[in-house]
Each structure stands twice: as C-alpha cells, then as structure tokens.
C-alpha cells in the first residue's frame, strides 16, 4: 500500500459515532462500456457552441484533475462559420460526486462531496428583456 | 430515509479482508450553493438542439433518482423554428460517480460505480463520409 | 510535465527478489496512479499491476497475483515495485507509466498511460 | 480477460505512404483505446488515447478512429522518424492489456 503522513486526528474505522459513515469498497465498477460507444470526443470543436477544456486542480479530492468546458463564444457559429451574436452559447452543467480526504491526509477517511461542472457548451436563443 | 430489508450477508464494517475498503462519511458536503444560481434549468427548452429529461430511479444506487436527457431531433432547430437536418443534435455525455448496495440492501455497505449519462445536447456539423 | 525515473540495472538469480523504484517529479503525486508494465526481450508490453495513489489502493495482473507488490511512498513520491521468486523469464525492462486519473472529456477518470520512466533492465540468470 | 489483436504484425512502407494498423478488442470496449508508439531501446509514447483523442505534441499525421471492439491507428504521409513499434491498449476493464504490436519499417 501506500505510505502517508498518518493526519493524528484520522477517524477510527470502528468509531459507531462517525457520521453516516458507510464502508466502501473503491474497486470501482464501470457500466459503460457495453453502453453507446458513440462518445462526444470531437463535439467541443464540431458543435455550434464550441468550449475549450480547463485544467482545475485539487491533490485532496478524486479526481484530482477536473477539466471544466468554457464556452469559446459569447455567440453561437453560423452555417457560414462566424461568430452570430444573436444567439449565445451557454455551459451546460452537471453536479457531480468527488471524494475528499478528510481529515486531509488521511488515507482510509474521506467525505462524498457535490461539485458543479461545466461538460460541454449549447446554443441557446437569448432571453430578450424589453424595457417599457 | 429509506427503510430497506437487511441482507443477512452484509459485509461486517470491521472486516479487515473486506476488499479495499474505506470510511466514507455520506453527510454530502455541497460545493455548489455559492456558485452562479444560474443553472441550466430552462436551456433543454431554448437550445437550438432542445432536450427532454427522463428520469431513472434506482433504489439501490446512490443518488437514487438520476436525470437523463434524450435529443428531442436528429437535426437542430433553426432560426425559422423549423428542423434542420444538416445539423444534428448530439448528447453531450459524462461518466459520474454513484454509490451501488452491494450486497444488495445493506445499508453501511457500498461500491463505487461509474456510470454514464447524458447531460443535455449540443448542435454539431455532421462528419460527411465520401464514398469513392 | 510529469518525469518518471527509475532505478538502475538489475541482476539476479533465480529465487531471488527484486525492487525497482520510480521516482516522479512535476504534477501533484497524490492525484495520479502508477502502473508496473515488462516487457521481455523482443516481446510485447505486459501490464502487471498498478497503485492509485488517492486511496493507496492496489490491482495487480492475475499473473504475478502473490507474488507482486505495489508500492508508494507520497512523503518522497516514489512508487515501488516488488517482485518475488525470480524465475529466468522474469529477464525484461520494467517500465512504470502515469494513469492520470483526471475527469476529462466526459470520463470520470482517464486511464492512459501519459508519461512512462526510462526502463530498468532485469536480468535473472543463475 | 480482454484480448486485443492487432494486424498486420509488419509493415514495410515507403516514406508518405499512408499507414493503417487495426485493433481488434475480444469483447466491447467502448472507446477505452489507446495507442503507443516505442522506438528501438526506447520507453513507449503515448500517440492517441480514447480511440480518436490527439495528444499535445505528436504530430497531426497520426489519428485514431473507432469504438466497440474495432479500432483503427492511421498514419497520413509516414516520415523515417515513424519507424518502430506500434501498440494498442485497453483500459475498459482489468487487467488492462496490450496488443502484440506492429512493427512499421521503413523501405
């Protein structure tokens, strides 16, 4: 196994008052591949609302590395090929579970989180406010 | 909560053999309040690749109740309203993280599953293949 | 840019143990997995076994099952293999390679191998 | 465990011929594919990995394509650097595993 800096303040595995803690096991299972394998590799350059990918970074959390989509347009692409300001591209986000060790440093404790991200981008028409 | 038949084969919390097991504590922590309120909740309706949401409901995953989107056309709308079939509407798809019982109905014990899911659509240039 | 550097040469004779290190530099340690992979002369690549460093949890290859074992030590950055009862076919390079583990392009996690150490050549001969 | 099984084995081409190695996975691996590139006496480099995704800094003459269980590995115009073997590898499922390779000559 791996060997860590041991947080002195671990919880103990056995402690019953650990809140809502469950035993997990982390091998962990993928459902996917028997699934469409029609994945959206190339999307963020061929859609209408192309994004570009964004390295975010946190060592305490699984996965460590998230690459966030960010929209590379206010506008959407025409059929010509240029930027229509009439329409807007938008991040279409998803909440996601990570992992984060906790305390920080422990290996066998860790928290379930919620994150928002941002997986891809869509061309919406725009909400037009008109003033009286 | 829910309240689920105990298997009687639930794996014991202090099972040192139980395999590559950890603590997670399940009292989710959301990173998300403070982030922009502005969701994507209406874009499935005004995207020029519009999407409907389905939802799948699983007992014995967690989240329980997971959402997914399904391309309400093959072409994307354009700006008359109308299908455009030179286009298609795409799902933009990504793999999560969610809790499976395992064994069936214990309820302090989980694995990790990786599934994949459609988060929403975008509008893409079809790829043209030239026969010779 | 991550680099991967590994110990020197080997030779060993048969029964004997052995325990390559790979040293990484550069990205965060914690957040990626180190795969073992040998390859014997003039053959293929043969994955054996890898560590992911987040949960110091541990596959290995049905192969080499009892008789590899993975390690890492976060404090210095170096993922260890060790490899048991050395036989004459054990003779090979033994690569370690980065599993990134990143949420990336509609994957929870990405398992390439992206960045691979020089290579430490085994020799098991009596 | 997965099988994959890659043809040909060898390849001898003319420099700018186009080059197409296939990969052929025993059972659906969705586009958990990856390809390497290892020069004689050399580590292996990773050239395309998710079947078709490119990676920074190989040159855009290398692509991938596929998903299920048939890939292909193209080379558009082979260069004398191109020389060496090339291999598949799956990470849908453990353990991951390896084709036998292809290894590309240059006439």
């Known amino acids: 196994g791996i060997t860590i800096p041991r947080n002195p303040g671990c919880p103990n595995s056995e402690d019953k008052n650990f809140p809502r803690t469950v035993m997990v096991n982390l091998n962990i299972h993928n459902r996917n591949t028997n699934t469409n394998p029609k994945r959206s590799s190339d999307y963020y350059n061929r859609s209408t609302s192309p994004w570009n990918l964004h390295r975010n970074e946190d060592p305490e959390r699984y996965p460590s590395v998230i690459w966030e989509a960010k929209c590379r347009h206010l506008g959407c692409i025409n059929a010509d090929g240029n930027v229509d300001y009439h329409m807007n591209s938008v991040p279409i986000q998803q909440e996601i579970l990570v992992l984060r060790r906790e305390p920080p440093h422990c290996p066998n404790s860790f928290r379930l989180e919620k994150i928002l991200v941002s997986v891809g981008c869509t061309c919406v028409t725009p909400i037009v406010h008109h003033v009286a | 909560g829910i309240t689920i038949p105990r298997n009687p084969g639930c794996p014991n919390s202090e099972d040192k053999n139980f395999p590559r097991t950890v603590m997670v504590n399940l009292n989710i922590h959301n990173r998300n309040t403070n982030t922009n309120p502005k969701r994507s909740s209406d874009y499935y309706n005004r995207s020029t690749s519009p999407w409907n949401l389905h939802r799948n409901e699983d007992p014995e995953r967690y989240p329980s109740v997971i959402w997914e989107a399904k391309c309400r056309h093959l072409g994307c709308i354009n700006a008359d309203g109308n299908v455009d079939y030179h286009m298609n509407s795409v799902p933009i798809q990504q793999e999560i993280l969610v809790l499976r019982r395992e064994p069936p109905h214990c309820p302090n014990s989980f694995r990790l599953e990786k599934i994949l899911v459609s988060v929403g659509c975008t509008c893409v240039t079809p790829i043209v293949h030239h026969v010779a | 840019e991550v680099q991967l550097v590994q110990s020197g040469a080997e030779v060993k004779k048969p029964g004997e143990s052995l325990k390559i290190s790979c040293k990484a530099s550069?990205?965060?340690?914690?957040?990626?997995?180190i795969s073992w992979v040998r390859q014997a002369p003039g053959q293929g690549l043969e994955w054996m076994g890898g560590i992911t460093h987040f949960f110091g949890s541990t596959d290995y290859a049905q192969k080499f099952q009892g008789r590899v074992t993975i390690t890492a030590d976060e404090s210095t950055t170096t993922a260890y293999m060790e490899l048991s009862g050395l036989t004459s076919d054990d003779t090979a390079v033994y690569y370690c390679a980065r599993e990134p583990n990143e949420f990336w392009n509609g994957y929870y996690t990405t398992h390439d191998f992206d960045s691979w150490g020089q290579g430490t050549t085994v020799t098991v001969s009596s | 465990e997965i099988v994959l099984t890659q043809s040909p084995d060898f390849q001898s081409v003319t420099p700018k011929e186009k080059v197409t190695i296939t990969c052929r996975a025993s059972q659906a691996i969705g586009s958990e594919l990856h390809w390497y590139q290892q020069k004689p006496d050399q580590s292996p480099k990773l050239l395309i990995k998710?079947?078709?995704y490119s990676v920074s800094g190989v040159p855009s003459r290398f692509s991938g394509s596929g998903s299920g269980t048939d890939f292909t590995l193209t080379i558009n115009g082979l260069e004398a650097e191109d020389a060496g073997t090339y291999y598949c590898h799956q990470s849908a499922s453990l353990p991951y595993t390896f084709g036998q390779g292809t290894k590309v000559d240059i006439k």
């Open positions: 550069g990205g965060s340690f914690i957040s990626y997995g």
């Open positions: 998710y079947a078709s």
